[in-house]
Interface confidence: low
């Protein structure tokens, strides 16, 4: 029986932990009955052959955040019971090809954040029990064919942040049990047809932060169990018809930060379980009818930071469960009165940072549960009578940074805002832009003695742009809704009100990026 090395702490449960920059060589002697050994944050640079000979009961070895640059080929000899090995966050450039030959019962092998430049084809040949292999954050420019062929039990493989430019289409062909494959933060520009065909149990595929320009039509056709697909921040300009046809279990799809110009009807579907679709930061200019009609469980649709100038009236058909719709920071000038009609469960809609000149009176007619509407920074001069009257749950309405025309036509909106001031938030209130006599004054607190209607040029909406109030039988004016006050700021979801630079962070990070 060995005692505990002076630079380590040992518990009765056979756990040994050695930490600290003062440790420059492998501590010894190690207790013969050690089952867990952690060597963390030391200055150890080398692992000799003889340090683990007498601790054959070891099950977990964690050597992380050291200066480890050199491991002798027989360093892990006699560790036949080892199940978990982490060498992450060291300075390893190469691994001896037979380094792992005696630890063939490993279940997890973590090699992330080293400086590995290559993996030998036979490096992992004896790991039939391996469940997780982490190679994130190395310098592997190429994965040789056959390197994973014996890892038949592997369920999680992370190859992110390495820098490969291409993949052999055969490299994953024996990984039928793989559930998570992370290839993000590389330089992949093209993924050959068939690369993922053997991965029938795959649940997560992370391909974000690459340079992928095109997707082969059948690339995901064998991945019927896929639940999360991350394709954001690539160079994808076109989605082939049918690309997502065989993904009935998909519940998250990220496509933001690409070069998509259009969405053909039916490209998304059928995906009955998709809950979130992230399409911001693309170059989409219009949305056709039925663009999302197969996504009847979709709850979040993010289309902000595109170049949308036209949305077909039936673009959102089928989205009966949508809760959040983000359309901000586009080039919208007009919206059809029926565009949101099928969105019966919509809670939050963001339309800020567009060029909207007017809104149809019926725009929110069927969206009775709306809680937040963001209309700031548009070209609105007035709003139709009764437009918000039926929205009993509305608790956040942002109207500032619009060129409000404060003549007598604004009175109904002014009166409604007085009664519903709490819904406007406390940050910025809407301000009159014209006529000159009231420019800069708050639309909410301005004196009600407005000037008469100004003479309007052809570019200005006529008063007739107000709908007939008979379309709302329960309301006689825009001010008929009783005031709603909020006791807390946590009652609602504040959707996408941050500046564009933050939008990427709020809507862009994925679980996959944590490795």
């Amino acid at each position: 029986y060995y005692g505990c090395p002076s630079e380590c702490t040992c518990s009765r449960a056979s756990q040994v932990e050695c930490t600290g920059a003062q440790i420059v060589a492998m501590p010894s002697p190690l207790p013969w009955n050690a089952m867990s050994l952690q060597i963390l944050n030391t200055h150890i640079t080398e692992l000799p052959e003889d340090k683990f000979l007498n601790i054959s009961a070891l099950i977990a070895l964690k050597m992380e955040k050291n200066e480890l640059a050199n491991i002798m080929p027989g360093a892990f000899r006699n560790l036949g019971s080892l199940r978990h090995l982490s060498l992450a966050n060291n300075k390893l450039k190469n691994l001896p090809v037979r380094l792992f030959q005696d630890v063939n019962n490993l279940e997890t092998l973590l090699l992330s954040n080293n400086q590995l430049v290559q993996i030998q084809p036979a490096q992992f040949s004896q790991f039939s029990n391996l469940k997780e292999l982490q190679l994130y954050g190395n310098n592997l420019e190429y994965i040789p064919e056959g390197v994973f062929d014996h890892l038949v039990g592997l369920t999680k493989l992370n190859l992110g942040n390495n820098g490969f430019t291409h993949l052999s289409p055969r490299v994953f062909q024996h990984l039928g049990n793989l559930q998570v494959l992370r290839l993000y933060e590389n330089r992949l520009s093209d993924i050959p047809m068939g690369t993922f065909d053997a991965l029938g149990n795959l649940q997560e595929l992370a391909l974000q932060e690459n340079q992928i320009g095109t997707l082969s039509p059948g690339l995901f056709h064998n991945n019927r169990n896929l639940q999360r697909l991350y394709l954001s921040n690539n160079h994808i300009s076109h989605l082939p018809p049918g690309i997502f046809m065989q993904l009935p279990h998909l519940n998250k799809l990220t496509l933001f930060g690409n070069s998509l110009k259009e969405l053909s009807p039916g490209v998304f579907g059928p995906m009955p379980n998709l809950r979130e679709l992230w399409l911001y930061n693309n170059h989409i200019t219009s949305l056709p009818d039925n663009a999302f009609s197969h996504l009847n469980q979709l709850q979040v649709l993010i289309l902000s930071h595109n170049q949308l100038s036209y949305i077909s009236p039936g673009a959102f058909n089928g989205l009966t469960n949508l809760r959040e719709l983000s359309l901000h920071t586009n080039a919208l000038q007009d919206l059809d009165g029926n565009v949101f009609r099928s969105l019966a469960n919509l809670r939050n809609v963001s339309l800020q940072n567009n060029r909207l000149r007017q809104l149809p009176g019926s725009i929110f007619a069927n969206v009775n549960g709306l809680m937040t509407i963001q209309l700031q920074n548009n070209n609105l001069e007035n709003l139709p009578l009764g437009i918000f009257d039926h929205l009993g749950n509305l608790c956040e309405l942002r109207l500032y940074d619009n060129p409000w025309r404060c003549d007598s036509n604004i009175l109904p909106l002014h009166d409604w805002l007085i009664l519903n001031r709490a819904r406007l938030g406390t940050d910025t209130l809407p301000v009159c832009s014209s006529p000159a006599s009231v420019r800069g004054q708050s639309l909410v607190i301005i004196n009600v003695n407005f000037p008469g209607p100004s003479v309007q040029g052809p570019e200005t909406p006529e008063v007739s742009s107000y709908p007939d109030t008979s379309s709302y039988p329960d309301s006689t004016s825009i001010s008929s809704t009783t005031e709603i006050t909020r006791s807390t700021d946590d009652d609602y979801t504040d959707l996408n009100t941050i500046e564009p630079i933050d939008d990427r962070n709020t809507w862009g990070m994925t679980d996959a990026q944590s490795g």
Epitope: E145, T165, H166, S168, P169, R170, D190, P192, M193, G194, T195, D197, A198, P217, G218, H221, N222, G242, Q246
Partner: antibody
Amino acid sequence: QVQLQESGPGLVKPSETLSLTCTVSGASINIYYWSWIREASGKGLEWIGYVHHSGGTNYNPSLKSRVSISVDTSKNQFSLRLKSVTAADTAVYYCARDTYGPFDYWGQGTLVTVSS
Amino acid sequence: EIVLTQSPSSLSASVGDRVTITCRASQGISNYLAWYQQKPGKVPKLLIYAASTLQSGVPSRFSGSGSGTDFTLTVSSLQPEDVATYYCQNYYSAPWTFGQGTKVEIK
């Protein structure tokens, strides 16, 4: 052992449709892709197109307007149809297993002559 | 489409000679290149894929090299049974394309 066998008429009249079937044995058609390739006399090898068991296809643009490839997974077969043939379509037609590019197993080939 | 140009079109060499065939792609195809051997009256046979990986059962005297646009097939010691036409094939992007072939004969 994986084997592929082409079958179909050896003589087709000009302007008619060439139809061939490839029967796969020793392997499931539900894995990999399945291609047709032809070799005209003195012309070398020309890839015609492939089919995936899901029905997905990809064709050589030079033939795309005339060709269709289909799959019958229940019979472990895939088929080629080439419309409006001319004498230039006379060739040995091979079916092959397409392992995402390289063709590792080929049929024996069948000579199709286009002649009236 | 990617055009593959083989050279030479034909060659004649003695048994035991080292023979080299080159294949040039019209644009970069990484290592997505295969080589085939077709003996007279026979079916093409896959020799090498991924530019340099020997297909199972192929004699070790065959080897491949190259990446990007320039590729080489080498027979280290030519044997009588190696008389055939050799084709390179691109599988980087569809349409898959073949070189025009190189005919190898024995002197």
